[in-house]
Interface confidence: medium
């Protein structure tokens, strides 16, 4: 729960970028360009970089905790390095001309500081016990206290990352992860389901049978209903997840020849905001005490949207929050799903927790038989997936949508790409159904636009 | 251009209600997380509540908690927030924000109304 992190999930990142040699932006003038120093470090030894104004030299790296100061003067001379100062860092051996900026843990975010910054480690930022963390973004966490689960039990109990699943006793709904008394259910509600037999007897016994019998009979006879339709969906279910075994598993790879030289044009990141231009109130939050935190998530059939993938305007966006989009694609619509995924290898396109449009394209072209053996190759466990569809009750669509939406959260954003999902569809034979993905999420103009995305 | 306009505040008193309506524009308003700010005279900003896009979360403070209750309304491009059992402390202007995205590294927000004055007095 309250365990440690970098704030902003700097320090992986950072470890990556000192040892691939990218930088961050204030020390990007000050080093050369990527695609070249890759290619002269790779001249020198591990341990080593070459000289930038001699190549034949090949100077000692820098220890984590110092930076570059000037490079060693000839072949087996020293580098001069220079410890960090006070309020930076550097985590691992390097050829940096600045130390990184140490981070601050977000007080007005509830966080708080586990371990401070010192030369060669970046501050460590967590939350109180009894807390978990709830990402807006990416990089930007919020401390919230666990759910107690009164007037009910502990399904999973809280975690680092993930408020505890409460199922209410009897007499109780659960709202906003709380479980609350059924006195309190108002028929407008979702509650009504679960608070039935409660309602009813609320109206008083001295109602004759049938008005208690009549609401019965027609719950149950909607149940049989919905059954049956659920019947002949997954008879429909089977008979699509046949034909995409045969259309998408199949078509697509005996055309892979055929677009060779097609070129397909990537996926833009979508460009930060700038802040508003009119009203900026005062910088940063006044700090609010942690304890003053306080989550509440319900998960109820009503919230369940139109899944169709939305089509995106200017600049769509958890979210992760977990929960929010990031990445606007390129509009036109792109031939060969088997090019452009192979092609993005080399330049991986982050797919973004809070793009739904994505998300939900995925969702709605896997085949759903397909679907537990899709999110298992992606790394979550029977257990995650789950926790997901409990969390999510009826409404199996988000409960999918949560599964890609956890598996993005946790994975590196390098690596949570396009071409990773490409690559797991291929091995499920399924690659033929990327093309479908595609038409969902930039598809022909000829497509209708879509619903709105909640009720 | 993104604009996010706040109304609904007014003077009440202690025990009473008001409702907050947010209502936005320049932007693809159900796919953003939204939220609530706000400020009271002389202090900082305090964070009050939160709602993903698909308006299934919902998170507060614990100075409000059981007493607002923010939804939305993606149809109509609306935020709002119910302000039941308001108390002399509740006294603030509020501001509806639209959360910042995954590439944002900086604040929780990267738009905000204009704010509505919300008086809770006697």
């Known amino acids: 729960m309250g365990l440690s992190t970098v704030p902003d999930l700097l320090l992986p990142l950072v470890l990556l970028e000192l040892l691939v040699g990218i930088y961050p932006s204030g020390v990007i003038g000050l080093v050369p360009h990527l695609g070249d120093r890759e290619k002269r470090d790779s001249v020198c030894p591990q341990g080593k970089y070459i000289h930038p104004q001699n190549n034949s030299i090949c100077c000692t790296k820098c220890h984590k905790g110092t930076y570059l100061y000037n490079d060693c003067p000839g072949p087996g001379q020293d580098t001069d390095c220079r410890e960090c100062e006070s309020g930076s860092f550097t985590a691992s051996e390097n050829h940096l001309r600045h130390c990184l900026s140490c981070s601050k843990c977000r007080k007005e975010m509830g966080q708080v500081e586990i371990s401070s910054c010192t030369v060669d480690r970046d501050t460590v930022c967590g939350c109180r016990k009894n807390q978990y963390r709830h990402y807006w973004s990416e990089n930007l966490f919020q401390c919230f206290n666990c759910s107690l689960c009164l007037n009910g039990t502990v399904h999973l109990s809280c975690q680092e990352k993930q408020n505890t699943v409460c199922t209410c006793h009897a007499g109780f709904f659960l709202r906003e992860n709380e479980c609350v008394s059924c006195s309190n259910c108002k028929k407008s509600l979702e509650c009504t389901k679960l608070c039935l037999p409660q309602i009813e007897n609320v109206k008083g016994t001295e109602d004759s049978g049938t008005t208690v019998l009549l609401p019965l009979v027609i719950f149950f006879g909607l149940c049989l209903l919905s059954l049956l339709f659920i019947g002949l969906m997954y008879r429909y279910q089977r008979w699509k997840s046949k034909l995409y075994s045969i259309v998408c598993g199949k078509s697509t790879p005996e055309k892979e020849g055929e677009l060779e030289g097609t070129t397909t044009k990537p996926l833009a990141p979508n460009p930060s905001f700038s802040p508003t231009p009119g009203f900026t109130p005062t910088l940063g939050f006044s700090p609010v005490p942690s304890s003053t935190f306080t989550s509440s998530s319900t998960y109820t059939p009503g919230d369940c949207p139109n899944f169709a993938a939305p089509r995106r305007e200017v600049a769509p966006p958890y979210q992760g929050a977990d929960p929010i989009l990031a990445t606007a694609l390129a509009s036109d619509p792109i031939p060969n799903p088997l090019q452009k995924w192979e092609d993005s290898a080399h330049k991986p396109q982050s797919l973004d927790t809070d793009d739904p449009a994505t998300l939900y394209a995925v969702v709605e072209n896997v085949p759903p038989l397909r679907w537990k053996e899709f999110v298992r190759r992606l790394g979550l466990s029977d257990h995650e997936i789950d926790r997901l569809e409990l969390q999510n009750g009826r409404c199996l669509r988000e409960a999918q949508y949560s599964m890609l939406a956890t598996w993005r959260r946790r994975t590196p954003r390098r690596e949570a790409t396009l071409e990773l999902l490409g690559r797991v569809l291929r091995d499920m034979d399924l690659l033929g159904c990327l093309e479908d993905i595609e038409e969902a999420l930039c598809g022909p103009a000829a497509l209708p636009p879509a619903p709105s995305l909640l009720r | 251009e993104v604009q996010l306009l706040e109304s609904g505040g007014g003077l009440v008193q202690p025990g009473g209600s008001l409702r907050l309506s947010c209502a936005a524009s320049?932007?693809?308003?159900?796919?953003?997380?939204m939220g609530w700010v706000r400020q009271a005279p002389g202090k900082g900003l305090e964070w009050v509540s939160s709602?993903?896009?698909?308006?299934?979360?919902?998170y507060y403070a614990d100075s409000v908690k059981g007493r607002f209750t923010i939804s939305r309304d993606n149809s109509k491009n609306t935020l709002y927030l119910q302000m039941n059992s308001l108390r002399a402390e509740d006294t603030a202007v509020y501001y509806c924000?639209?959360?910042?995205?995954?590439?944002?590294?900086?604040?929780?927000?990267?738009?905000w109304g204009q704010g509505t004055l919300v008086t809770v007095s006697s």
């Open positions: 709602i993903a896009w698909l308006g299934s979360e919902t």
């Open positions: 320049g932007f693809t308003f159900a796919t953003y997380n």
């Open positions: 924000a639209k959360h910042c995205k995954a590439e944002c590294t900086g604040d929780l927000f990267d738009y």
